[in-house]
């Protein structure tokens, strides 16, 4: 908290400009004006102030703004976001995506910060959906975001949305996770071509149920073996030897080398043994 | 609902076989989605995992104790058996049957019983 | 093999606090990794089962994350109940391994 004093003559800021830096904190107190501070804080990214003095910048802009700042104050604070709580983001109502990637241009190279969780939040909230233009942004920064979600708030997300995932998005997610996004990429990519439909769905299918992959298998899509190994265990077991067989195409070879991982083990372990001994790569069941 | 019980004798002589058994109660030991297994814990040390049977007679070993495992499965008994050949004193420990659920993992455990070798 | 690293190796802590245990995998096991309570005298017992589901009857207090190599077991809010030691286990890998352990004690 820096002490009310009054501001030296010919110190009162008319603009913000560079020669600010050479203010002290309670000068900058003193003698810059909160509302000038709110009108030209798209000058303040520019100014290498201290993170001393970025605190009486901040504290400045929280006087004038108790209950939370304006988005147009908001699109210009830049590195000031760095100083910001999460309680901070709360009090906002952040609307703009212009907004939204201007700030997390400010924490780009970053490991998501409490803040910016908190800013995605309040974003999402407040269009009450994530959109395939918001996911696209948020993917583009954060490529695990939306493995982030829980399976509750993967709900919101639109089918329309699915559109936006690139495979590395949802390489953290869990089998809880692609189980609430598979029916929504199936809805989105329903109207595609066999091998278009089965190149936009395999990242999503560590959620698909067992009727699905029988169905895949009668479409010569050749499915590779790390794709096999992110299957729900449970839509795996029921699959005969032979569907197994098309499903995977000349991967199939590839079940050989994981015979001892899951979910191959426990399919192999449910399989008769005459069937296993047709595919001619010494499984024991 | 699905119970364990282990049962054999609680000491064996060093360069013997140690034999327990387990029996299921509650549900049954050919059940599609379980296989069963046998867990050890030394006195104040950690699990070690021992093996695993399927109904259907297969079986999976702990590499490191392959050699002198055998686990078996008896469908008309609802049990399976744990044989440990040649064992030691590093062989004392609580020995668990578990079933192993899968889609969870060790889900329902016996209460143990206490092997202890020594001549 | 695939060896599971737990850590700490013990913790002392307090009624309330939130406690964090880590287990790490010698190689990737995807989200195939469980968490198990033992009580002194007694079995293990369940807790999370595919990395971070919730196995029934357990408090939701209790809860996993984490894939491939690294995983966690939080404990939001230590009751009394929950001093015990707690092991990691991976089912993906035939050799089914247990972490060493992780006691939690009274501070």
């Known amino acids: 908290e820096v002490e009310k004093t009054a501001c030296p003559s010919g110190k009162k800021a008319r603009e913000i400009d560079e020669s600010l830096i050479f203010y002290k904190k309670w000068e900058l107190e003193a003698c810059v004006d909160a509302a000038l501070l709110a009108t030209q804080m798209d000058r303040v990214n520019a100014i290498p102030f201290t993170y001393e003095q970025l605190d009486v910048l901040k504290h400045k802009l929280d006087e004038l703004y108790p209950q939370g700042y304006p988005e147009s104050v908001i699109q210009h604070l830049g590195y000031l976001f760095l100083k910001m709580s999460p309680e901070d983001i709360r009090k906002w109502n952040v609307t703009s995506l212009e907004t939204l990637k201007a700030l997390l241009e400010v924490n780009k190279g970053h490991e998501m910060s409490p803040q910016v969780a908190t800013l995605i939040d309040r974003f999402v909230k407040g269009r009450g959906q994530l959109d395939k233009d918001t996911l696209d942004t948020l993917t583009a920064f954060y490529p695990g975001y939306l493995c982030s979600l829980s399976p509750e708030e993967l709900s919101s997300v639109p089918p329309s949305s699915i559109w936006a995932v690139r495979p590395q998005d949802l390489d953290t997610c869990d089998p809880r996770q692609l189980d609430v996004l598979y029916p929504k990429a199936r809805l989105a990519f329903q109207n595609m071509n066999g091998s278009e439909y089965f190149v936009k769905i395999q990242s999503f299918l560590g959620g698909a149920p067992t009727e699905d992959l029988k169905a895949l298998s009668q479409q010569n899509v050749s499915m590779d073996l790390a794709t096999f190994m992110k299957l729900r265990t449970d839509a795996v077991l029921p699959l005969t030897v032979a569907e197994v067989q098309k499903l995977l195409g000349p991967h199939v070879e590839g079940l050989k080398a994981e015979e001892r991982h899951r979910p191959v083990r426990d399919w192999i372990l449910r399989q008769r043994q005459d069937d296993l001994d047709t595919l001619g790569l010494g499984l024991q069941g | 609902q699905v119970q364990l019980q282990e049962s054999g004798p609680g000491l064996v002589k060093p360069s013997e076989t140690l034999s327990l058994t387990c029996t299921v109660s509650?549900?049954?030991?050919?059940?599609?989605?379980?296989?069963w297994s046998w867990i050890r814990q030394p006195p104040g040390k950690g699990l070690e995992w021992i093996g695993y049977?399927?109904?259907?007679?297969?079986?999976n070993y702990n590499p490191s104790l392959k050699s002198r495992v055998t686990i078996s499965v008896d469908t008309s008994k609802n049990q399976f058996s744990l044989k440990l050949s040649s064992v030691t004193a590093a062989d004392t420990a609580v020995y668990y049957c578990?079933?192993?659920?899968?889609?969870?993992?060790?889900?329902?455990w016996g209460q143990g019983t206490m092997v202890t070798v020594s001549s | 093999d695939i060896q599971m690293t737990q850590s700490p190796s013990s913790l002392s802590a307090s009624v309330g606090d939130r406690v964090t245990i880590t287990c790490r995998a010698s190689?990737?096991?995807?989200?195939?990794l469980n968490w198990y309570q033992q009580k002194p005298g007694k079995a293990p017992k369940l807790l999370i089962y595919a990395a971070s589901s919730l196995q029934s009857g357990v408090p939701s207090r209790f809860s996993g994350s984490g894939s491939g190599t690294d995983f966690t077991l939080t404990i939001s809010s230590l009751q009394p109940e929950d001093f015990a030691t707690y092991y990691c286990q991976q089912p993906y890998d035939a050799s089914y391994t247990f972490g060493g352990g992780t006691k939690v004690e009274i501070k």
């Open positions: 049977i399927y109904y259907s007679g297969s079986t």
């Open positions: 578990a079933r192993d659920n899968v889609f969870t993992g060790f889900d329902i």
């Open positions: 190689q990737s096991i995807s989200s195939y």
């Open positions: 509650g549900g049954s030991v050919s059940s599609y989605y379980s296989t």
